[in-house]
Interface confidence: low
């Protein structure tokens, strides 16, 4: 299989991306070709290249290869967006684990198992040897990096800088040890690219040697990146098509994570008495189908043989013979004990939406004493007594311990958005519980707002139309990029946190996103000196119905002349009518020859009552919304500016008072814009910043 391999499978692809060398001493080689596959083959074989090829870019417009002796992790190089470019990086140079004996390992570990620094391969001090880079071409005996040029048993090794120890193996883990998955790996997005028998996986975007239906563009949320193992179809574990023409597909050897913490976006809400959605989270004990026929045990193969076993579907709670929905069917079901009826739906289980006497809370739920003990994302609450230290850290009074029993959802800190609990998951320290306010409860959670309550309507996308190009200090303005393209705005409210809108995240895969800071041009042209590009490490969704997201950056932004934070308003504050404010965005501007520059549109605050009248009484605003009208006809937010801020100034302080979300019209004369009122959610924002761990700079 190695002999006739199509080498493009050995590369990690970053679409619409190229590498720009800042260091002019770095060499590159180019040539006209027809396909990226041709570039890959030449890069892998280093054929006719005056350097070791670590990456290449395929220029689709010019049908040209650019081969590089560096990759995106090298110094003197930066990534840049470009529609016509696709960047391919040799996985061997960016992998930090080994496959098999590690013969292909080309990473940068340079310390042995016992912690001794490696001797450079080109040096004979302190140990003389015959492993010269010139004698082992293609084995990448660079610097003093651990290598296994002969494919020996112990894995990558090196001569050591200690005269007493000639050589020693390096402690580089097997990729199969590093990679782990939860449940059956449906949410696995790791980098395993070979099967359990060692066959290399076929790229998902290729149809050779095996034609298939799982096209990445057709299933954008399945994580079909490069040729990594995935589980898009509810199999017992991740798998891939292989490069072996005789083996269509095979499972991959990915172990189950030790703590088995599920990604919160993938966990269905667990219920025991009723069905939420399709009932994937149903964990009750109903064990007959709709007509009373008893269910067959999941761990039994009689009377019906099947592969829906507890071993194959680890997190689906296939206990006893209870109705479950492990495979995304329309509702919970089971195999039946009647040999003539293989499966049946348990449609007698009521729908949660219809069940009466459901849990609810009044006001902000500070007196809620129900016994729900699960967050909205399905995580089990952890005991209050284990979390008192954390609780004391963000409230300035002694909580009522008599209310904080067991792990029930509570509201000890007077949170405006209802009961919550700690989770025990370090990534999601706490979250709200799926309890609604009681029907007919109109107790305001904050006072002084002129409004009845109604949910927000969602219509068109928003972009700043007919705005004026801005060059003032707007260092807090963030361009959120999705697959290398601007998709939304955002506001940097803390070095590691960006406030934006829920609608900005079409995919669950955080690798799809980047935050660009310090730019004025949407493509970053002319902003090279000031631009910061940061990855996204977590999304924290706002309280139910808020449309807000706090986006955590993988590392803190560096505050300088071009990047700054913007202040938040005080919780529950109101700003006087006619206060002058501005909205910012890079969205479509109504101009034919759009220059891609950040625009600003000036608006003024309007009371909720008056705002409702301007919308011909078709909308009523609630305490979580704020309204601002344009000074200029047809000027205001429009498509593509979601997540961006409504910025107002009061007492010489600029702050983000609103967030642009899909609103009620796009730059329509006499139609003011309706924004999420940040003041209503300020406590939530502060609480997240205080309680969620962020990386240190």
């Amino acid at each position: 299989q190695r002999k006739r391999r199509n080498t493009i499978h050995e590369f990690k692809k970053s679409a619409k991306t190229t590498l720009i060398k800042i260091d002019p001493a770095l060499k590159i080689k180019t040539k006209k070709v027809n396909t990226a596959d041709q570039c890959a083959n030449r890069c892998t074989r280093n054929k006719g290249l005056p350097f070791t090829c670590k990456a290449f870019v395929f220029d689709k417009a010019r049908k040209q290869c650019l081969w590089f002796p560096f990759n995106s992790m090298s110094s003197g190089v930066k990534k840049e967006f470009g529609h016509e470019f696709d960047l391919y990086e040799n996985k061997d140079y960016i992998r930090n684990c080994i496959i098999g004996k590690g013969r292909s390992y080309k990473g940068t570990v340079s310390i042995t198992k016992s912690g001794i620094k490696c001797q450079p391969w080109s040096s004979m001090i302190p140990h003389e040897h015959s492993f010269l880079p010139s004698s082992y071409r293609g084995k990448d005996l660079q610097e003093n990096y651990c290598r296994n040029p002969r494919g020996e048993e112990g894995g990558p090794w090196c001569f050591t800088s200690n005269p007493e120890v000639r050589y020693e193996v390096c402690d580089i883990p097997q990729c199969s040890e590093v990679e782990c998955m939860t449940c059956n790996g449906e949410s696995y997005r790791g980098l395993m690219d070979h099967t359990e028998s060692g066959k290399i996986c076929q790229r998902w975007d290729h149809q050779t040697p095996h034609r298939h239906k799982f096209l990445p563009e057709r299933y954008p949320d399945k994580g079909f990146d490069d040729n990594y193992c995935r589980n898009p179809d509810g199999q017992p574990r991740p798998w891939c098509y292989t490069l072996d023409p005789h083996t269509r597909w095979e499972y991959c050897a990915i172990k189950t994570c030790a703590d088995n913490t599920m990604n919160d976006t993938d966990v269905p809400l667990e219920t025991t008495e009723c069905i939420q959605g399709q009932g994937e989270g149903y964990r009750g004990t109903v064990n007959t189908i709709w007509n009373g026929i008893p269910c067959q045990r999941w761990d039994s193969q009689y009377p019906h043989e099947h592969d829906m076993t507890p071993e194959n579907f680890k997190c689906k709670d296939l206990r006893e013979n209870y109705c479950r929905n492990p495979d995304g069917s329309e509702s919970p079901w089971c195999f039946t004990t009647d040999p003539n009826i293989r499966v049946g739906y348990c449609s007698q289980i009521p729908n949660c939406d219809m069940s009466h006497g459901q849990d609810c809370y009044r006001g902000n739920g500070k007196n809620y004493m129900g016994n729900l003990s699960q967050t909205r994302s399905g995580l089990t609450c952890s005991m209050w007594d284990k979390n008192m230290e954390d609780l004391h850290r963000h409230i300035f009074w002694e909580p009522d311990a008599s209310k904080l029993n067991e792990n029930y959802c509570r509201n000890p800190d007077d949170d405006a958005h209802g009961p919550w609990c700690y989770t025990g998951n370090p990534l999601i320290p706490w979250d709200y519980c799926p309890i609604s306010r009681c029907e007919g409860d109109t107790t305001p959670t904050i006072v002084n707002l002129d409004h009845p309550v109604i949910s927000c309507a969602k219509t068109k996308q928003l972009r700043v139309v007919n705005g004026i190009p801005t060059r003032t200090n707007i260092g807090w303005m963030v361009s959120l990029r999705y697959r290398n393209k601007h998709i939304c705005g955002g506001s940097l409210i803390k070095e590691s946190w960006v406030l934006t809108a829920r609608q900005c995240f079409p995919s669950r895969d955080l690798k799809d996103y980047e935050a660009w800071l310090g730019i004025h041009d949407v493509h970053g042209r002319g902003d090279e000196k000031c631009k910061q590009v940061l990855n996204v490490s977590q999304l924290v969704y706002g309280p139910e119905g808020s449309d807000l997201v706090l986006m955590k950056l993988a590392r803190p932004a560096v505050l300088d002349d071009f990047v700054s934070t913007i202040d938040l308003p005080n919780y529950g504050c109101t700003i006087p009518e006619k206060t002058s404010c501005s909205v910012y965005g890079w969205g479509y501007t109504g101009l034919i020859n759009y220059d891609g520059l950040l625009r600003v549109a000036h608006l003024y605050i309007m009371g909720n009552e008056k705002c409702s009248q301007h919308h011909r009484g078709k909308v009523t605003l609630n305490e979580s919304e704020i309204c601002a009208g344009a000074e200029k006809i047809g000027s205001g937010p429009c498509e593509g500016d979601y997540g961006g801020p409504l910025v107002c100034e009061q007492h010489k302080m600029r702050m983000v008072l609103g967030v642009i979300v899909p609103g009620r019209g796009c730059a329509i004369p006499n139609r003011p814009g309706i924004f999420v009122r940040v003041a209503y959610y300020a406590k939530w924002i502060h609480k997240i910043i205080l309680t969620y761990k962020v990386p240190q700079s």
Epitope: R211, K213, F214, L215, R218, G234, M308, D327, G328
Partner: antibody, heavy 117, light 112 residues
């Protein structure tokens, strides 16, 4: 794959056709229904996936209901009209992993439905 | 989405070649999501070709499929008496949140 239940019905009288499979695990294969009016071409009605979810051709939505309880797949014609007179075929779709297309690789002989007053 | 088959009917002598075209009103969701079926009187259709050019199991190699996008062709070379039948093309189109399947109107092949 064997269809049954075809008969003469009056307009508006609901009719359920049954497709019985043997040697096919319905938890691994999707099944589809296709019809053919006398002397006319094939017309796709809909299919039921391995997880029990049904999809329909745009024109067939509301007029037909597909369901399954292994080893049978049912097609219910909710309110037949004379235009529904046809031979109804039940067919297996090739396994998802063999091709990316919806392809009917195994067909029953069909069952004739006549709608007439 | 409409699939138009031409010509119909088509006749060929034993040993000759028959070409049937199928034109789509819009592109398929994937260039190759296309199949050909053979149906003889009183029988159900039989799969000949899928993915535009892949021969189904047990189908003689004289049947050949080609084309992509909106234009597809079935060629029968070295026609035999047993090939007298009606041939249907079938394409899969993107249609809202599901895939729509459509059949062509059929082409009758008469063997002389």
């Amino acid at each position: 794959v064997e269809e049954s239940g075809g008969r003469l019905v009056t307009p508006g009288t609901p009719l359920t056709l049954t497709c019985t499979v043997s040697g096919i695990d319905l938890s691994n294969y999707a099944m589809g229904w296709v019809r053919q009016a006398p002397g006319k071409g094939l017309e796709y009605i809909g299919m039921i996936g391995v997880n029990g979810r049904a999809w329909y051709a745009t024109w067939a939505k509301g007029r037909f209901t597909i369901s399954k309880t292994s080893p049978t797949v049912d097609l219910k014609i909710t309110s037949p009209t004379t235009e529904d007179t046809a031979t109804y075929f039940c067919a297996r779709l090739i396994d998802e992993r063999s091709t990316y297309s919806y392809v009917f690789d195994l067909w029953g002989q069909g069952t004739l439905v006549t709608v007439s007053s | 989405q409409v699939l138009t088959q031409t010509p119909s009917p088509v006749s060929a002598a034993v040993g000759g070649t028959v070409t049937i075209n199928c034109q789509g009103s819009q592109s398929l969701y994937n260039n190759n999501a296309f199949s050909w079926y053979q149906q003889k009187p009183g029988q159900p259709p039989k799969l000949l070709i899928y993915d535009a050019s892949t021969l189904a199991s047990g189908v003689p190699s004289r049947f050949k499929g080609s084309g992509s996008g909106t234009q597809f062709t079935l060629t029968i070379s070295g026609v035999q008496c047993a090939d007298a039948a009606t041939y249907y093309c079938q394409g899969e189109f993107s249609c809202g949140d599901v895939d729509c399947i459509a059949f062509g109107g059929g082409t009758e092949v008469v063997v002389k």
